[in-house]
């Protein structure tokens, strides 16, 4: 439909309905985790409200089991935060020791899974070292960005200790994505 | 108008207007805090420039008394950052002193009121301990997410200590909102 | 097109057409920089890569010389995450050596040229003051807002210290823009 | 493993159009950008373009923009390069040849297919 | 586009010798590569990244260079390096080849 610009100006082009309010759109927000078996050196995936609260998904934008279902193909504005919160790091018990000095760190990644390859796609990744000097820390890391992404794509968030992330209030870890 | 996908291929379906330029969206910029009196547990709420420099609110997108006004119901993507800034945070202090190592906090908050309903709901939050070391520190919160909102609801955006926002410049401390 | 929410209700009014999909869009991602020459208190901007991987543009918005092109006039939403990394700050430095205790620091800022004008207009920024007590250290900084571009602006992201960017994953460090 | 496997040799008339197909395996297709690149006999290697699987973006060679077109579908892990307004000096074996990043290089090549321009 | 010129264009080459391959870009480059080519067979990467060794290949390889001015070199010629050797920029579309090097054994 590109060069339409150049249509004189008494000749109005429309276009094929994409209303507005019918695109596919999702915001999660976080629940208590249930510890779950993950493999070792793979980041375990956060479980969401999809429906109570803040929470909802529409026009076939669907959430089971961890997935954000893609229901249409095209660019999408995915997003997250997930707010993290722990105890003195071990990167300040060994600098105290005098072990060497290797920070923790935290991650978030949103990884996209395509049925017809096994291996995932990390479309987003936060990571921050943890090496804080009080007793108790917390903070957020939010992620952001546009993707193509194909009809029947699943999204997820995983996160590198699921034991830190702070699941208290919904407005503190999220994730959502909505077609462009 | 879902399911119109089956509309047969000759049969072109239009949508009713809704031209993305006519759409109400918002972008608000940091000005200098007048101190106000806030109920202790309440966080203040920030005021904001709405139209000059790179700040603007069009096609019905009000800004008035700290709040954004939401002039039609439908999904919006709400946005902000709040740069902090501050001296050796009382954490390091009580550290050094030996008493219980309480970390400080920073905290902003994007709230909707809806006049119908008496208390506000937390829509976002980003907070995060602040335990530095260095005599002076300064720091960002972003936040980002896609709400349901309501003709008439407002917006505003609250901070745990209004001093120490950062309103030098437009560009480290802002707040958005457009329609989807 | 304003007022016509005031048209009879028989009357179906439909919007000259902005299909969705025909919208300038780009995700760019990190690639390894290549040392250059920038001026004194001016910070160096990145390159990206714009059609491998997650990166891709579209729909005339194009990418040459570290810089994205704006097609066409209208409202856009513009991010990015520059993902940082360096060894024990300066900061934990000078305050072990009892010497006064600046932070160092990394920033971000989204800036805008415009050929008409001389002067870069700095869009967004992030900065955070560094003072890491670990031996190395790795933080994000996220930003995203919407601006009002012209026909022939163009963007690019300017960081403090380009030694310091993570250019190992495409999904650490990343910049986008898209027309609303 | 990582396999390319391209469709077969086709003998075509001057002005014709050649499609030739590559099918992916072993690897996720949309994560890796697919080139085409083509071999004149005893001649050097000649990029033709690129096309991303992931976003459907394509950069072609000045070239031969105009002439040829590439293609995907996901669906399949296959990867089409389709060439028109054939001449005789687009006698040649042609290859699909797919990359992660650019500092990786082209990692992965097809078999090769060879079209032959004669009338 | 960047014009990759290499050479020598032909070596021949006695097993066990060092041979010493360069690639010369008409602009500065940032990413190069390097491919072998056997008579009849696809091109293989070698080099990837200026001086990484591509996945399964023997550490006699070896690649360098900056800027405009890259070398790929074979420590030690075995009989079954005889190939046709070509270098690739992909700095600047149209990601170009060089002219190649045909090494011959002895």
């Known amino acids: 439909l590109k060069g339409q610009e150049f249509a004189p100006s008494h000749q109005q082009v429309y276009a094929p309905l994409r209303a507005d309010g019918d695109k596919p759109r999702a915001h999660l927000t976080v629940v208590r985790q249930t510890p779950t078996q993950h493999f070792k050196n793979q980041f375990p995936a956060l479980h969401w409200e999809h429906e109570l609260g803040l929470a909802f998904t529409k026009n076939r934008m669907n959430y089971t089991n961890k997935f954000l279902l893609i229901p249409e193909s095209g660019d999408y504005f995915i997003y997250s935060q997930v707010t993290f919160r722990g105890m003195t790091s071990e990167c300040s018990e060994i600098r105290q020791a005098g072990r060497p000095n290797k920070p923790d760190s935290i991650t978030v990644v949103i990884t996209k899974v395509t049925d017809s390859y096994p291996e995932p796609t990390q479309l987003l990744m936060g990571t921050k070292s943890v090496c804080e000097v009080g007793s108790n820390w917390f903070q957020p890391i939010y992620l952001g960005a546009m993707f193509s992404l194909q009809e029947g794509d699943k999204l997820m968030v995983n996160v590198s200790d699921i034991s830190l992330v702070d699941y208290t209030k919904e407005d503190k870890t999220f994730f959502g994505a909505f077609l462009l | 108008l879902k399911g119109q996908e089956f509309a047969p291929s000759h049969q072109q379906v239009y949508a009713p207007l809704r031209a993305d330029g006519d759409k109400p969206r918002a972008h608000l910029t940091v000005v200098r805090q007048t101190p106000t009196q806030h109920f202790k547990n309440q966080f203040p709420a920030l005021h904001w420039e709405h139209e000059l420099g790179l700040a603007f609110t069009k096609n019905r997108m009000n800004y008035t008394n700290k709040f954004l006004l939401i002039p039609e119901s439908g999904d919006y993507f709400i946005y902000s950052q709040v740069t902090f800034r501050g001296m050796t945070s009382e954490c390091s202090e009580i550290r050094q002193a030996g008493r219980p190592n309480k970390p400080d906090s920073i905290t902003v908050v994007i709230t909707k009121v809806t006049d119908s309903y008496p208390e506000p709901t937390q829509l976002l939050m980003g907070t995060k301990s602040v335990c530095e070391v260095g005599s002076n520190w300064f720091q960002p919160i972003y936040l980002g997410a896609m709400f349901s909102l309501q003709e008439g609801d407002k917006l505003m955006v609250n901070v745990s200590d209004i001093s120490l926002v950062d309103y030098t410049k437009e560009d480290k401390t802002f707040f958005g909102a457009f329609l989807l | 097109l304003k007022g016509q929410e005031f048209a009879p209700s028989h009357q179906q009014v439909y919007a000259p057409l902005r299909a969705d999909g025909d919208k300038p869009r780009a995700h760019l991602t990190v690639v390894r920089q290549t040392p250059t020459q920038h001026f004194k208190n001016q910070f160096p901007a990145l390159h990206w890569e714009h059609e491998l991987g997650l990166a891709f543009t579209k729909n005339r918005m194009n990418y040459t010389n570290k810089f994205l092109l704006i097609p066409e006039s209208g409202d856009y939403f513009i991010y990015s995450q520059v993902t940082f990394r360096g060894m024990t700050s300066e900061c934990s430095e000078i305050r072990q050596a009892g010497r006064p205790n600046k932070p160092d620091s990394i920033t971000v800022v989204i800036t805008k040229v415009t050929d008409s004008y001389p002067e870069p207009t700095q869009l967004l920024m992030g900065t955070k003051s560094v003072c890491e007590v670990g031996s190395n250290w790795f933080q994000p900084i996220y930003l995203g807002a919407m601006f009002s571009l012209q026909e022939g602006d163009k963007l690019m992201v300017n960081v403090s210290d380009i030694s310091l960017v993570d250019y190992t994953k495409e999904d650490k460090t990343f910049f986008g823009a898209f027309l609303l | 493993q990582v396999q390319l496997v391209q469709s077969g040799a086709e003998v075509k008339k001057p002005g014709a159009s050649v499609k030739v197909s590559c099918k992916a395996s072993?690897?996720?297709?949309?994560?890796?950008?697919m080139n085409w690149v083509r071999q004149a006999p005893g001649q050097n290697l000649e990029w033709i373009g690129l096309?991303?699987?992931?976003?459907?973006?394509?950069n072609y060679n000045q070239k031969f923009k105009g002439r040829a077109t590439l293609t995907v579908d996901t669906s399949i892990s296959t990867a089409y390069m389709e060439l028109s307004r054939l001449r005789s000096d687009d006698t040649a074996v042609y290859y699909c040849?797919?990359?992660?990043?650019?500092?990786?290089?082209?990692?992965?090549w097809g078999q090769g297919t060879l079209v032959t321009v004669s009338s | 586009e960047i014009v990759l010129t290499q050479s020598p264009d032909f070596q021949s080459v006695t097993p066990k010798e060092k041979v010493t391959i360069t690639c010369s870009a008409s602009?500065?480059?940032?990413?190069m590569h390097w491919y072998q080519q056997k008579p009849d067979q696809s091109p293989k990467l070698l080099i990837k990244?200026?001086?990484k060794l591509a996945s399964g290949v023997p550490s006699r390889f070896s690649g360098s260079g900056s800027g405009t001015d890259f070398t790929l070199t074979i420590n030690s010629l075995e009989a079954e390096d005889a190939a046709t050797y070509y270098c690739?920029?992909?700095?600047?579309?149209?990601?170009?080849f060089g002219g190649g090097t045909k090494v011959e054994i002895k």
């Open positions: 096309i991303n699987p992931y976003s459907g973006g394509t």
């Open positions: 602009s500065s480059v940032n990413y």
């Open positions: 990244d200026t001086s």
């Open positions: 072993g690897y996720s297709f949309t994560g890796y950008t």
């Open positions: 040849a797919s990359i992660y990043q650019r500092h990786d290089g082209i990692a992965y």
């Open positions: 690739q920029q992909w700095s600047s579309s149209p990601y170009t």
